[in-house]
């Protein structure tokens, strides 16, 4: 076990702070909530509080909750592979760009990080060239979530790794607007980190809302499980 | 690269770079270094939609494309500028903090632009 993994034993506070710009739009959101490791379990709510938020809630949540990847649940075979945990409290930079097909992109820059007790995620999102009247402006995106596979890979030269995947979110008339994700995460301390061989985590979420709230909102449940490397020859012949 | 030359200011020149699989990238970009100058980011691409960015001394005259068959980044230059005369290089970039942040830390020989007024 590595020592940011000790962290991860029980249920995590979380805090999630966003700043952002959408070609021009400026808006801030707060998100809380906790995250449960054992399982891979994230439950958060998150609040625009700056008023109504201009693009769609679903364009962020891999900004928010893909943002901690802390907490996917990974095997017990797999533990050596969880970089995420063992860059913990310390904590790591996780930069993205995301490109939305016939759209623009969001470029984003997040410190995940403990704060005290709390699992902080600390971002900052700036969007460029989009459609006024496109899916993500012109908000024309479904209020759901697709299940996704988020490729890893070990980034040496960094002391961190990259990682790749591609969103579809569903538009109201039927179609898919899809979005490319493109991630590398590197530790702010200096301490060792586990770099991982290849391999995926699998999410699932769901969005919902809360009926007592006023303000524009997400609420977000989400499990994620890391895969796709299988047990090593010992363990099969056991 | 190559397509560079020598041209009159308001002329224009289309610059080609054929990414071979070691240097190629889902984002390639292209730079310039005038003499005595740092090395500048001038016009990005995402090959996978074709989105793309430019700094903003070139936007409106520079227009970064691809031939994915052939495996070539693009870039036509316009009206172009004194103040443009630099060597231009194409690079594989880091998607992931596109536009202008270099994949490897290879740069191929480039090519020449000289613009007289």
């Known amino acids: 076990m590595s020592k940011g993994e000790e962290l991860f034993t029980g249920v995590v506070p979380i805090l999630v702070e966003l700043d952002g710009d959408v070609n021009g739009h400026k808006f801030s959101v707060s998100g809380e909530g906790e995250g449960d490791a054992t399982y891979g379990k994230l439950t958060l709510k998150f609040i625009c509080t700056t008023g109504k938020l201009p693009v769609p809630w679903p364009t962020l949540v891999t900004t928010f909750s893909y943002g901690v990847q802390c907490f996917s649940r990974y095997p017990d075979h797999m533990k050596q592979h969880d970089f995420f945990k063992s860059a913990m409290p310390e904590g790591y930079v996780q930069e993205r760009t995301i490109f939305f097909k016939d759209d623009g992109n969001y470029k984003t820059r997040a410190e995940v990080k403990f704060e005290g007790d709390t699992l902080v995620n600390r971002i900052e999102l700036k969007g460029i060239d989009f459609k006024e009247d496109g899916n993500i402006l012109g908000h024309k995106l479904e209020y759901n979530y697709n299940s996704h596979n988020v490729y890893i890979m070990a980034d040496k030269q960094k002391n961190g790794i990259k990682v790749n995947f591609k969103i579809r979110h569903n538009i109201e008339d039927g179609s898919v607007q899809l979005a490319d994700h493109y991630q590398q995460n590197t530790p702010i301390g200096d301490g060792p980190v586990l770099l991982p061989d290849n391999h995926y985590l699998s999410t699932q979420s769901a969005l919902s809302k809360d009926p007592n709230e006023k303000r524009d909102h997400m609420v977000l449940l989400e499990f994620v499980t890391a895969a796709g490397i299988t047990h090593g020859m010992d363990e099969l012949y056991k | 690269e190559s397509g560079g030359g020598s041209v009159q200011a308001g002329g224009s020149l289309k610059l080609s770079c054929a990414a071979s699989?070691?240097?190629?990238?889902?984002?390639m970009g292209w730079f310039r270094q005038a003499p005595g100058k740092e090395r500048e980011g001038v016009a990005s691409?995402?090959?996978?939609?074709?989105?793309?960015y430019y700094t903003d001394s070139v936007k409106g005259r520079f227009t970064i494309s691809q031939d994915n068959a052939k495996n070539t980044i693009y870039l036509q230059m316009n009206s172009l500028k004194p103040e443009d005369t630099a060597r231009y290089y194409c690079?594989?970039?880091?998607?992931?903090?596109?536009?202008?942040?270099?994949?490897?830390?290879?740069w191929g020989q480039g090519t020449q632009v000289t613009v007289s007024s």
């Open positions: 690079a594989a970039v880091n998607c992931a903090r596109w536009p202008f942040d270099r994949e490897y830390n290879y």
């Open positions: 691409i995402y090959r996978g939609y074709g989105n793309t």
């Open positions: 699989g070691y240097i190629s990238s889902n984002c």
